[in-house]
């Protein structure tokens, strides 16, 4: 015997209180698949989050981060502060890369310069806080 709720499309819920008719999701909620018995609350992009895609009756809202921050985690679950190139984010804020390390992005950590001698090469262009060394022949 087929479940009558399976006929309810995305954007609706199967209303058990009304002989399992398909009722539209309330505002600020959605159902992305058919046959659901409830709708899900839409994600709200507040504070440092901003709305990249509005919630609809069939899909959740999508957030990204306000300028000066970048997304972390699945579905942009967190926003992390940007730093400048040549810096990394620490508990005390953005700090310059130590000598011998670099970061060419606004996120992530400072990484050591390439050791050219390990490949039997010499340094062609010196490294900076923002750029790795360039190895030569």
């Amino acid at each position: 015997l087929q479940d009558p709720c399976s006929n309810c499309p995305a954007g609706t819920f199967c209303d058990n209180n009304r002989n399992q008719i398909c009722s539209p999701c309330p505002p600020n909620s959605f159902s992305s698949a058919g046959g659901q018995r409830t709708c899900d609350i839409c994600r709200q992009c507040k504070g440092v989050f901003r709305t990249r895609k509005e919630c609809s009756s069939t899909s959740n809202a999508e957030c990204d981060c306000t300028p000066g921050f970048h997304c972390l985690g699945a579905g942009c679950s967190m926003c992390e502060q940007d730093c400048k190139q040549g810096q990394e984010l620490t508990k005390k804020g953005c700090k310059d890369c130590c000598f011998g390390t670099f970061n060419d992005q606004k996120r992530g950590i400072c990484r050591p310069w390439t050791n050219c001698s390990l490949d039997g090469k010499s340094v062609l262009v010196n490294g900076t806080k923002e750029r790795d060394v360039v190895c030569g022949p």
């Epitope: 819920f13 209303d15 209180n17 009722s23 999701c25 309330p26 505002p27 600020n28 909620s29 018995r37 409830t38 709708c39 899900d40 609350i41």
Partner: nanobody, 122 residues
Framework: EVQLLESGGGLVQPGGSLRLSCAAS????????VGWVRQAPGKGLEWVSA????????YYAESVKGRFTISRDNAKNTLYLQMSSLRAEDTAVYYC???????????????RGQGTQVTVSS
């Protein structure tokens, strides 16, 4: 017991106005997310308007934006829908509804009244 009693419907000419009322009992209207749904002849339910987040934001269906206004009187525990510039396609039974938030995180809605018939015709 939760009760919702709608009134104010009737027959009106295109371009006319009506004000629907919903008297609530058994719960405090101002502490709930509430609104109006409608069912046109031969069609499914459609959300028309709602007051969400304890009175913070309002929702209007695209088809009624700029024509309908939702409000509530907390002292009278009554919800209103002011309808203007009415069109034939607004003909429907209008129900007062309460959004229900379930413990597991799901959302549904509940409407207990008989609804009020709005007919827009010349």
């Amino acid at each position: 017991e939760v009760q919702l009693l709608e009134s104010g419907g009737g027959l009106v000419q295109p371009g006319g106005s009506l004000r629907l009322s919903c008297a609530a009992s058994g719960f405090t209207l101002s502490a709930e997310d509430v609104g109006w749904v409608r069912q046109a002849p031969g069609k499914g339910l459609e959300w028309v308007s709602a007051i969400l987040d304890f009175g913070g934001s309002t929702y209007y269906a695209e088809s009624v934006k700029g024509r309908f206004t939702i409000s509530r009187d907390n002292a009278k525990n009554t919800l209103y829908l002011q309808m203007s510039s009415l069109r034939a396609e607004d003909t429907a039974v209008y129900y007062c509804a309460r959004v229900v938030y379930h413990a597991g995180g799901g959302v549904t809605f509940d409407y207990r009244g008989q609804g009020t018939q709005v007919t827009v015709s010349s």
